[in-house]
C-alpha cells in the first residue's frame, strides 16, 4: 500500500490512503540498487553524517563550571573580561580540518568501512521506520528545548562543508531527552536533487524531499570525542522536510544565504534565529531508536529522535536547497544521503501509539513490539 505523504498536521502513521495499488517502484529511490557517481552507496560503500569528522577533528566541547553556565571551547581564543571568560562570537564548536575521515564522499571510493570501520557496524543509521511495528512507549515524554531562541547578534556560522550545509550552534541550547540533558552543537540538512527526494530516514520505504538533523552532545560527556561510540553520548533530532504551499520564513533565513556559500568550504555569518522554528511544532510525537552517525566515523550509540510531524517548505525553497551548493570536484552537492541500514533486531520506539490504525495494513494481524523503557 502507498503510504500517504505526511502533511504538517498529519502523522507519519496517518490514516490509510485508501489506495490499493502496491508501492510502486517509482516511489522508491533507486540509488541503493544502481549506484552512480552522485548516488549514496549501499551497505558496503556506506556514507554517513554530520560535519563531525574524525575523532581528532571533532570540536572539544567542555561544559563550563556551574557558575559560568555554558560551554567552554578549549581550542579557541577566549576573551577575558575582568575575571570572566567570554564566548567568542561565531567560533563555538568550530571544527578543524584535514583528517583522514574528512576524505569521504557519497558514492564511489573509498568504501566507508575503509574510512572508518564503524561504518560496517550492525546498528547503523539511517533506517526505514515502519510505524506499524514501532513499540508505543508512554515513558517517552514530550521533548523540551531550552534556549533555542537566539537574538540576531551575535551571528552564527553557516558553512558548506562539501557534504552538507551546516549551522554551528552557540553554547546554551539544551534538549531534555528522558532523564538526561543534551547540548545542541550543530544542525545540517540532507537533500536530493530535482524531482528526487533526499531524506535519510524513510517511512515504510517512502523517502521525503529532505531532512534536518540537530546534533547534540550528552551533558554526561565533556567532549565530543569522549562521547563517540558511547551509548547516548550523542543524540540527533531529525525531522522530514516536505513541500507545502507557503514559504517557510524560518528556513528562508538560511536558504537565502546559500548562494554566498555555493563553493565547497565557504562560509558566511547569519543572524541568530529561533532554532526551534526549524523543527516541527509537535514535540510530543516522535520515534526513537539507537543508531549511528550517518557519515564517517559512523559511530554507534547515537540516540535518534525522529519527529512524527513534518516541516513544510515551498517548492522554490526545496529547489534552492538542492540546487545551489557545490561539493567536491566541481560536482553539485546533491543526493547527500546514506542508504537505509538494516535494523538487525533493533526496535523503534514511538512516543505515541503509531501502530494503532496508522497503517494501510492495519486490518492484517501484526506483531506489535513492546516498549523497552521502564517506568515513567
Amino acid at each position: 500500500q502507498r503510504l500517504p505523504r505526511m502533511q504538517e498536521d498529519s502523522p507519519l502513521g496517518g490514516g490509510s490512503s485508501g489506495e490499493d495499488d502496491p508501492l510502486g517502484e517509482e516511489d522508491l529511490p533507486s540509488e541503493e540498487d544502481s549506484p552512480r557517481e552522485e548516488d549514496p552507496p549501499g551497505e558496503e560503500d556506506l556514507p554517513g553524517e554530520e560535519d563531525l569528522p574524525g575523532e581528532e577533528d571533532l570540536p572539544e566541547v567542555k561544559p563550563k563550571s556551574e557558575e559560568e553556565g555554558s560551554l567552554k571551547l578549549e581550542d579557541l581564543p577566549t576573551v577575558e573580561a575582568p575575571g570572566d571568560p567570554q564566548e567568542p562570537q561565531n567560533n563555538a564548536h568550530r571544527d578543524k580540518e584535514g583528517d583522514d575521515q574528512s576524505h569521504w564522499r557519497y558514492g564511489g571510493d573509498p568504501p566507508w568501512p575503509r574510512v572508518s570501520p564503524a561504518c560496517a557496524g550492525r546498528f547503523q543509521s539511517p533506517v526505514d521506520i515502519r510505524p506499524q511495528l514501532a513499540a508505543f512507549c508512554p515513558a517517552l515524554r514530550p521533548l523540551e528545548l531550552l534556549g533555542f531562541q537566539l537574538p540576531p547578534l551575535p551571528e552564527l556560522r553557516l558553512r558548506n562543508n562539501g557534504h552538507s550545509v551546516q549551522l554551528t550552534l552557540p553554547p546554551g541550547l539544551e534538549m531534555a531527552l528522558g532523564p538526561g540533558r543534551e547540548y545542541a552543537l550543530q544542525l545540517h540538512l540532507h537533500w536530493g536533487a530535482a524531482g528526487r527526494p533526499g531524506s535519510e530516514h524513510t517511512v515504510e520505504g517512502h523517502r521525503f524531499p529532505a531532512e534536518i538533523h540537530v546534533v547534540h552532545l550528552s551533558t554526561a560527556f565533556a567532549r565530543v570525542d569522549e562521547a563517540l561510540g558511547r551509548p547516548g553520548g550523542l543524540a540527533v533530532l531529525a525531522a522530514f522536510l516536505e513541500e507545502g504551499p507557503e514559504e517557510n520564513s524560518a528556513y528562508e533565513q538560511l536558504l537565502s544565504r546559500l548562494e554566498e556559500i555555493a563553493e565547497e568550504g565557504s562560509e558566511t555569518q547569519v543572524p541568530g534565529l529561533d532554532i526551534s522554528a526549524l523543527l516541527p511544532s509537535d514535540f510530543s510525537r516522535y520515534f526513537q531508536y539507537e543508531g549511528s552517525l550517518t557519515t564517517p566515523p559512523c559511530a554507534q550509540g547515537v540516540i535518534w529522535t525522529v519527529f512524527n510531524q513534518t516541516v513544510m517548505l515551498s517548492a522554490k525553497q526545496l529547489h534552492t536547497l538542492s540546487d545551489t551548493l557545490w561539493g567536491p570536484g566541481d560536482s553539485r552537492l546533491q543526493l547527500n544521503f546514506r542508504a537505509t541500514q538494516p535494523l538487525n533486531g533493533r526496535v523503534i520506539e514511538a512516543s505515541f501509539p503509531a501502530g494503532v490504525d496508522s497503517s494501510p495494513r492495519a486490518a492484517e494481524p501484526v506483531q506489535l513490539n513492546s516498549c523497552l523503557a521502564a517506568g515513567d
Epitope: 567568542p88 561565531n90 531562541q149 547578534l153 551575535p154 551571528e155
Partner: antibody, heavy 119, light 112 residues
Framework: QVQLVQSGGGVVQPGGSLRLSCAAS????????MSWVRQAPGKGLEWVSA????????YYADSVKGRFTISRDNSKNTLYLQMNSLRAEDTAVYYC????????????WGQGTMVTVSS | QSVLTQPPSVSGAPGQRVTISCTGS?????????VHWYQHLPGTAPKLLIY???NRPSGVPDRFSGSKSGTSASLAITGLQAEDETDYFC???????????FGGGTKVTVLG
C-alpha cells in the same frame, strides 16, 4: 585588560550632529558584535543600535532609525555612532557595549559619555 | 514606558532576601528569549550580574541568583549587604520590536 573607552560626547543644539567613538582593547574586537545603549536622566536603560562583527549587518531602535548610523573600523578596533538631527529627547549618557554573549547579554561596557541636546 | 516591567523599588534589612521581578510578554521572555540582569551604580558602567536567566559570570557572588518562568523572571539577592544598594535592570530580546529591551530598573534600598 579588557576595556571599552568612549569619547565624543558633548553639548549640541537640536538638529545638530555628534559622533561618538568607542575604542576597544584586550579582546579580539573584530570577532564581536557591538551595541550602543543609552540612559536618559532619571530614566532606565534603552538599547539604541547594534552592529555585527564584520559590520555587514546593523540594527536600530525605532526611536533613532534614519537619524543615527552605527559603524565600526575593525582595523582600528573602534566602534562609532554618528548622530544626526539630534533632539532634546536624545539627551542621555551613551554606553558602548559588547554583544559577545550568545544568549543576548551585554558583557563588557564602556564608561559612558554624556550627550546633551539643548538650545 | 519600558517593554519589561520591574517594580520601581524594593527594600530589605541587611542579611535579608529580596527579589526583583521582571515581567514581559509573549514576544520577549515568553517567546523563550533569555533574561539577563545588570547592576548599575549611576555614573558608572552597568555590570552584568546574571546572564542566560540563571548564570553568574565569575566574580559575581553567589548571593545573586536568577530564574525565569513563563513570561516573567526574577532576581534574588540573599544576605543583603550595604553595597547592594543600587539600581538593577533586567534585559531580553523582543522579536516583535526586533530590539534588545530593558526593564525600567529597580532601586534596591538596604534599610538601617
Amino acid at each position: 585588560q579588557v576595556q571599552l573607552v568612549q569619547s565624543g560626547g558633548g553639548v549640541v543644539q537640536p538638529g545638530g550632529s555628534l559622533r561618538l567613538s568607542c575604542a576597544a582593547s584586550g579582546f579580539p574586537f573584530s570577532s564581536y558584535a557591538m551595541s550602543w545603549v543609552r540612559q536618559a536622566p532619571g530614566k532606565g536603560l534603552e538599547w539604541v543600535s547594534a552592529i555585527s562583527a564584520n559590520g555587514g549587518t546593523t540594527y536600530y531602535a525605532d526611536s533613532v532609525k534614519g537619524r543615527f548610523t552605527i559603524s565600526r573600523d575593525n582595523s582600528k578596533n573602534t566602534l562609532y555612532l554618528q548622530m544626526n538631527s539630534l533632539r532634546a529627547e536624545d539627551t542621555a549618557v551613551y554606553y558602548c557595549a559588547n554583544n559577545g554573549n550568545y544568549r543576548g547579554a551585554f558583557d563588557i561596557w564602556g564608561q559612558g559619555t554624556m550627550v546633551t541636546v539643548s538650545s | 514606558q519600558s517593554v519589561l516591567t520591574q517594580p520601581p523599588s524594593v527594600s530589605g534589612a541587611p542579611g535579608q532576601r529580596v527579589t526583583i521581578s521582571c515581567t514581559g510578554s509573549s514576544s520577549n521572555i515568553g517567546a523563550g528569549y533569555d533574561v539577563h540582569w545588570y547592576q548599575h551604580l549611576p555614573g558608572t558602567a552597568p555590570k552584568l550580574l546574571i546572564y542566560g536567566n540563571s548564570n553568574r559570570p565569575s566574580g559575581v557572588p553567589d548571593r545573586f541568583s536568577g530564574s525565569k518562568s513563563g513570561t516573567s523572571a526574577s532576581l534574588a539577592i540573599t544576605g543583603l549587604q550595604a553595597e547592594d544598594e543600587t539600581d538593577y535592570f533586567c534585559q531580553s530580546y523582543d522579536s516583535s520590536l526586533s530590539a534588545w529591551v530593558f526593564g525600567g530598573g529597580t532601586k534596591v534600598t538596604v534599610l538601617g
